[in-house]
Each structure stands twice: as structure tokens, then as C-alpha cells.
Interface confidence: low
């Protein structure tokens, strides 16, 4: 009922709670002397469904038959309207529309851990939209019965608060849930189980790992479990991996040896437990243990390359370069690299440990046969050395690869191609493609990059440390035993016209011709590989087209003679530079007048 209903009543038949689709009769009746003040025939009773008028009647009572009410609660209010006054609320009623409960499905019970309590869950089925009470009943051996009720509108879980113990692990228990509301009741199918079926062990705890003799091959995982656990499953993975390795073990008694871990790798370990081979369920996974495996001596061999530079008649500079071992080869933190330089005929050897670098430069005599061995060392030992005999890599002209070309291949890639050397191509054991930024000074501090290619390959895609708008000096070496031949080319991955022209710094007169000298364009303004320089000149104050001389670009060249100028004529000269993409703007202009005799 709504409010105090002092003036009248609203009755609902057959009930305030009805089945979806049922018809309901609503009667609104005034109490004696509660109608309009003067004329009771003027009483106008109005029935509202929520705030919408659905029926009215003049008199002391109103009957209305209502159908098609939706699931849930509908509010009906009866009001009285008199002449010249506001409507007065008489009374109201709520009607609850719902359905009988469906049979609860998938009843399942679980006890978390040997000390936990039995809790059951089920699926309620569709919502009844009515107050529904659930009763969970558990019957066990010796006619024992436990019962628990749940009055929550959305009840699908109940904890009995009782603990099943393993005294009789095979004893049967039966659970059943019954749902009851005003429109009916329904019970689930019974669920029968034993202690072993429903006890779900707690996840293992106190997980530790031990490496005997600090060796990854002698690794034992330890953990603690509840007393009745029979089975464990272990899963582990490197921390940077998404894939787990899985191991199932029986009667592990809280320890298991792992044989396939990689050295110097952080792993994540988790363990789960179960009481019985085929009954019951696995525990949740334990909390993760994260641990790093110990180092092992490095495996694999360093990729080593070198450069020779002539210093003077008796000395040469050797620069050694090597690439880091992969993580799986280093098998630990590389503490230093050991470089051994040996003169093969005299047997003299020099060993040096290099820390923090992957290169080493030394000066040795030009005479003698020299070899180097480079190995990487971590806390457990050294990799086997890479041995290289130092030779003149470009000495064998017949081994030089032919028709070397370098073409841009997409963003920051250069495709290098070549033809095998004229000498028996089958003699080639491998090709090495080497590249470094071109610096006019031939700076030996510029980083060197290289890759090795099998003897049957005639192309290589270079992408490591390749920047746009930078020119690279690329060499292809063909190696055969203790001989090598090489060819070189300039290449870039992306180019455009240079940003500036060369700066003429001097013009000197020599026997009737002039020698122009210029400063190289800064590397960052070259915008790729330069192909040509152009020298332009024209008579001062003349409107004629300038003459020009085009010179092929050579790294070290920074002067050029011109012998077609007339004496005692003042000329204006300037220079430009060209890449494959176009010509730079002018460099500076210089005036010059040749003093020599006229022809």
C-alpha cells in the first residue's frame, strides 16, 4: 500500500505478485464522507499507472482490469478530482510481475585447501524479477545434513562454513540447491562428490631455486605444499617470452630438477598442485618466482674483421673490429675481450684484455706473418678464439670482385651486387662486404661495419647503421685461403642535391694556366655521394653564358687546373657539386685575372 490511504483503498486481485502475462483487477474505493464536499456524484476517481492516466469513473469506486504488465514492479495510484480543486491522492499499490524460478543448473562445490570451507556455486537461470530464496543442502555420510539459506536477490553462491576432512576421502556427499518465490519453486539436480573431488589445494608457496656449484645444469626448484598433494605441474619461461614450458611431476615432495634452462637468463617459475591423478582440480598457480640463472662459459665465436693502414716504410697500423656475441652465445656478462697478436714465424705473442670496446688498434712491423686471436670472457670462462691471419686484403687483383654496384633499396638500405672474380670463382671461400661513412680525411675513427656472405652469393643488403643522405664507402672482399682481392664503390640509401657548393679558397697562376683550390663541402651538406664538381667561369661584367669544366669527384682531390683563360681579362669563378639527384647552389665567387703574356 502507498501512503496512509486515509481517504480510500486500492485492492488488487488475484494478488500483488503475478505471473508474467496474467490479468489483474484493480479497485479504487472511497471511504465514507471522503468524496467531494458538495456533490458526491461529482466525485471523479482517476487511476494512474505511474504518472499516466489509464482510467477514470464518477462515483465512489472505480474498477479496472489491467493486462500486459511488464516484468518488474508497476506502481498504480488512485486520485480524486473535484470541481475547482487540485487532484487529491487517495491510495496506491505496487504490482510485482515475475516468473517462477528455473531449475538451478551446474551446481558445483569446492573446498579451497585442506583447511578451507565448502562453498557451492550454481547458475540461477533467467531472472525471476521477484524476491527469491535459495536453500543449499548438503547431505553426507551417517545421514548428516547441512543447510544454508541465501536471501540475496542475485544469489548464486553459498559457503557452508564447514570443513571436509580427509578421514574418509572416498565418502560421498550430495549437494542440492532449491529456489523458491511466490510463484513456485525448483530444485537443481543433486551433485554427488567425495573429499578428493572437491578439495582444491592451495597454491604452493615458499618457492626457491638453487643452482649447485653455480651451474645452470644443476638446478633444483623447491617449494612447500599441503600435505596430501600428489601431483604438481611446473611452468617456466624466460621473462621476455610469452610461451611457457610445462612439466608434470608425481610425488615430487616439494622439489624438482630442471635440466633445460638457458644460462644467464631471467626466468619466471610457477607451480600448481593436485591431490589425485584423475579426481579433483588443480590449484591456482603459485605466485611467480623470478630468478636469473648463472652464467656459463661463452659459446660460439666472435665475428672479427680488420683494417690495415700503411704508416711508413717499416710500420703498419692494424685496427681490429668484432661484433658482440648474441645473448645466447655470451651466456653471461662479457667482462673483457682477449686479443692475442702473434708473429707466426718468430713465435712472439702479445695478449691484451680489452674492456668496454669492440675494437683495438695497434702498430706492427710491415715484415713478418701476423695472426690474431680474439675471444670473449665472462665470469665462467672464454669463448673459443676466432683466429685470423693478417694479410693484405686487396693484394690479389685476380680475386677482386667485378662490376660492383650499390643501389638504394627502400629506406636506409643499400643493395650491393657484384660478379665473381675472374680467377676461378670456385676458389672464393667467402665474401665480406664492408661499409663506413665516407670522410674526406679518411678518418680511421669512423665506425666500420661488415657482413659476411657465402661464396655463391653475388649480392648483399646492408641496413645496419645506414643513414639517409650520407655517402658510404663500400668494399667487397673475396677471400681465398691466405689471399684476398677487393673492389670498392660509393653508395647511399637516399640522396638529394647538395646544400652548398665548394668554397674556393685559392686561385694561383702556374705557367699560363690557373690552379683552383677549394674546401670540401661539409659531410652533412653533401646529401649523398658526390659524383662531380663543376667549375664555372665567365668574364666579369659580361652577360655571356659561363663556361664550365666538370671534374669527376675523388675523395682526396681538392684542386684542379684550368688553362683556357685569356691573359689580362678579369674572370669571375665559382663551383658547384652534383649528386645523382642534382646540382648544388653556387659556392663563393672569386675574381681572377691571369697575368701571363697574350698569345
Amino acid at each position: 500500500k502507498i501512503d496512509a490511504c486515509k481517504r480510500g483503498d486500492v485492492t488488487v486481485k488475484p494478488s500483488h505478485v503475478i505471473l508474467l502475462g496474467s490479468t489483474v483487477n484493480i479497485t479504487c474505493s472511497l471511504k465514507p464522507r471522503q468524496g467531494c464536499f458538495h456533490y458526491s456524484r461529482r466525485n471523479k476517481l482517476i487511476l494512474y499507472k505511474f504518472d499516466r492516466r489509464i482510467n477514470f469513473h464518477h462515483g465512489h469506486s472505480l474498477n479496472s482490469q489491467v493486462t500486459g504488465l511488464p516484468l518488474g514492479t508497476t506502481l498504480f495510484v488512485c486520485k480524486l478530482a473535484c470541481i475547482n480543486s487540485d487532484e487529491i491522492q487517495i491510495c496506491g499499490a505496487e504490482i510485482f510481475v515475475g516468473v517462477a524460478p528455473e531449475q538451478p543448473q551446474n551446481l558445483s562445490c569446492i573446498q579451497k585447501g585442506e583447511q578451507g570451507t565448502v562453498a557451492c556455486t550454481w547458475e540461477r537461470g533467467r531472472d525471476t524479477h521477484l524476491y527469491t530464496e535459495y536453500t543449499l543442502q548438503l547431505s553426507g555420510p551417517k545421514n548428516l545434513t547441512w543447510q544454508k539459506q541465501c536471501k540475496d536477490i542475485y544469489c548464486d553462491y553459498l559457503d557452508f562454513g564447514i570443513n571436509l576432512t580427509p578421514e574418509s576421502p572416498e565418502s560421498n556427499f550430495t549437494a542440492k540447491v532449491t529456489a523458491v518465490n511466490s510463484l513456485g519453486s525448483s530444485s537443481s539436480l543433486p551433485s554427488t562428490f567425495t573429499f578428493l573431488d572437491i578439495v582444491r589445494p592451495l597454491p604452493p608457496w615458499d618457492i626457491r631455486i638453487k643452482f649447485q656449484k653455480a651451474s645452470v645444469s644443476r638446478c633444483t626448484l623447491y617449494w612447500r605444499d599441503e600435505g596430501l598433494v600428489l601431483l604438481n605441474r611446473l611452468r617456466y619461461r624466460p621473462s621476455n617470452s610469452r610461451l611457457w614450458n610445462m612439466v608434470n611431476v608425481t610425488k615430487a615432495k616439494g622439489r624438482h630438477d630442471l635440466l633445460d634452462l638457458k644460462p644467464f637468463t631471467e626466468y619466471e617459475f610457477q607451480i600448481s598442485s593436485k591431490l589425485h591423478l584423475y579426481k579433483g582440480s588443480w590449484s591456482d598457480w603459485s605466485e611467480s618466482l623470478r630468478a636469473q640463472t648463472p652464467e656459463e662459459e661463452p659459446t660460439g665465436m666472435l665475428d672479427v674483421w680488420y683494417m690495415k693502414r700503411h704508416i711508413d716504410y717499416s710500420r703498419q697500423q692494424i685496427s681490429l673490429f668484432w661484433k658482440n656475441l648474441s645473448v645466447s652465445e655470451a651466456r653471461g656478462k662479457i667482462l673483457h675481450y682477449q686479443v692475442t697478436l702473434q708473429e707466426l714465424t718468430g713465435g712472439k705473442a702479445m695478449t691484451q684484455n680489452i674492456t668496454g670496446h669492440t675494437s683495438w688498434t695497434t702498430v706492427i712491423p710491415r715484415t713478418g706473418n701476423w695472426a690474431v686471436a680474439v675471444s670473449a670472457a665472462n665470469s665462467k670462462g672464454s669463448s673459443l678464439p676466432t683466429r685470423i691471419n693478417i694479410m693484405n686484403l686487396c693484394e690479389a687483383g685476380l680475386l677482386a670482385p667485378r662490376q660492383v654496384s650499390a643501389n638504394s633499396e627502400g629506406m636506409d638500405n643499400i643493395l650491393v651486387t657484384w660478379q665473381p672474380p675472374r680467377k676461378d670463382p670456385s676458389a672464393v671461400q667467402e665474401y665480406v662486404v664492408e661499409w663506413r661513412e665516407l670522410h674526406p680525411g679518411g678518418d680511421t675513427q669512423v665506425p666500420l661495419n661488415w657482413l659476411r656472405s657465402r661464396p655463391y652469393n653475388v649480392s648483399a643488403l646492408i641496413s645496419e647503421n645506414i643513414k639517409s643522405y650520407i655517402c658510404y664507402e663500400i668494399r667487397v672482399y673475396a677471400l681465398s685461403g691466405d689471399q684476398g682481392g677487393c673492389s670498392s664503390i660509393l653508395g647511399n640509401s637516399k640522396h638529394k642535391a647538395p646544400l652548398s657548393g665548394p668554397h674556393i679558397n685559392a686561385i694561383t697562376e702556374e705557367k699560363g694556366s690557373i690552379l683552383i683550390s677549394w674546401n670540401s663541402i661539409p659531410v652533412q651538406e653533401q646529401m649523398g655521394c658526390l659524383l662531380h664538381y663543376r667549375i664555372y667561369w665567365k668574364e666579369r661584367d659580361s652577360n655571356s653564358q659561363p663556361q664550365l669544366c666538370e671534374i669527376p669527384y675523388r675523395v682526396s682531390q681538392n684542386s684542379h687546373p684550368i688553362n683556357s683563360l685569356q691573359p689580362r681579362v678579369t674572370y669571375v669563378l665559382w663551383m658547384t657539386a652534383l649528386t645523382a639527384a642534382g646540382e648544388s647552389s653556387h659556392g663563393n665567387e672569386r675574381e681572377f685575372c691571369l697575368q701571363g703574356k697574350a698569345n
Epitope: 656459463e296 662459459e297 682477449q338 692475442t340 702473434q342 675471444s375 670462462g381 672464454s382 673459443l384
Partner: nanobody
Framework: QVQLQESGGGLVQPGGSLTLSCAAS????????MSWVRQAPGKGLEWVSS????????YYTDSVKGRFTTARDNAKNTLYLRMNSLKPEDTAVYYC?????????RGQGTQVTVSS
């Protein structure tokens, strides 16, 4: 101090076999990579083979690959070189060395002569 004693050399016909041993003392043998090197008459030292400290990884110079096998017994502090299909060009003094490069301490060597 480091002591290395090679043994097992001798005269053998081409195609024959020999096993050289190297007894080590004075250092932690099981923590060191080891190698075999040789010196043919009138020539410089030539690296032959290396073996990692645990014995799991071995490397050989091309000319002996498939014919020679290096092994070690860390419990006995002994290094071995099993030589099969011997050729006249294998004639040399063979040394074991306390390093993976062959440039470390060496023993006195053992003479291997391959001749018919």
C-alpha cells in the same frame, strides 16, 4: 706452478692412429679451456684444436677436421688428442697449451712421425 706433460707420440705409418695425452697440474684444470698446437720441422707453431673448460665445445683447424678428436677428463686432469688417418704432413712435435688460443703455457711436447 703450471705443469703440462705430453705423452703418446711415436712413429706411425700413413693411415694409422695415435692417441696423445697431456697430464696437467698446478692450476684448476676444469676451469680452463685447453688446446693442442704443433710445430712441423722448420716451421712455426700451428694451432690444431681447442676444447672448452667443460668439454662441451671443440674446434679444429681445417686440415685435421674429421680425423682428429680432442677430449678431456676433468676428474683426471688429462687432455687427449685422438689422431686417425694420419698423413705425412701431420709429422710434428705436438704440445698441449693452457689456453684456448694455444698461446698460453706449453709442455715439452711429444714427437709424432708419420712415415712409411
Amino acid at each position: 706452478q703450471v705443469q703440462l706433460q705430453e705423452s703418446g707420440g711415436g712413429l706411425v705409418q700413413p693411415g694409422g692412429s695415435l692417441t696423445l695425452s697431456c697430464a696437467a697440474s698446478g692450476f684448476t684444470f676444469s676451469s680452463n679451456a685447453m688446446s693442442w698446437v704443433r710445430q712441423a720441422p722448420g716451421k712455426g707453431l700451428e694451432w690444431v684444436s681447442s676444447i672448452s673448460s667443460g668439454g662441451g665445445t671443440t674446434y679444429y683447424t681445417d686440415s685435421v677436421k674429421g680425423r682428429f678428436t680432442t677430449a678431456r677428463d676433468n676428474a683426471k686432469n688429462t687432455l687427449y688428442l685422438r689422431m686417425n688417418s694420419l698423413k705425412p704432413e701431420d709429422t710434428a712435435v705436438y704440445y698441449c697449451s693452457k689456453s684456448s688460443t694455444g698461446s698460453g703455457s706449453r709442455g715439452q711436447g711429444t714427437q709424432v712421425t708419420v712415415s712409411s
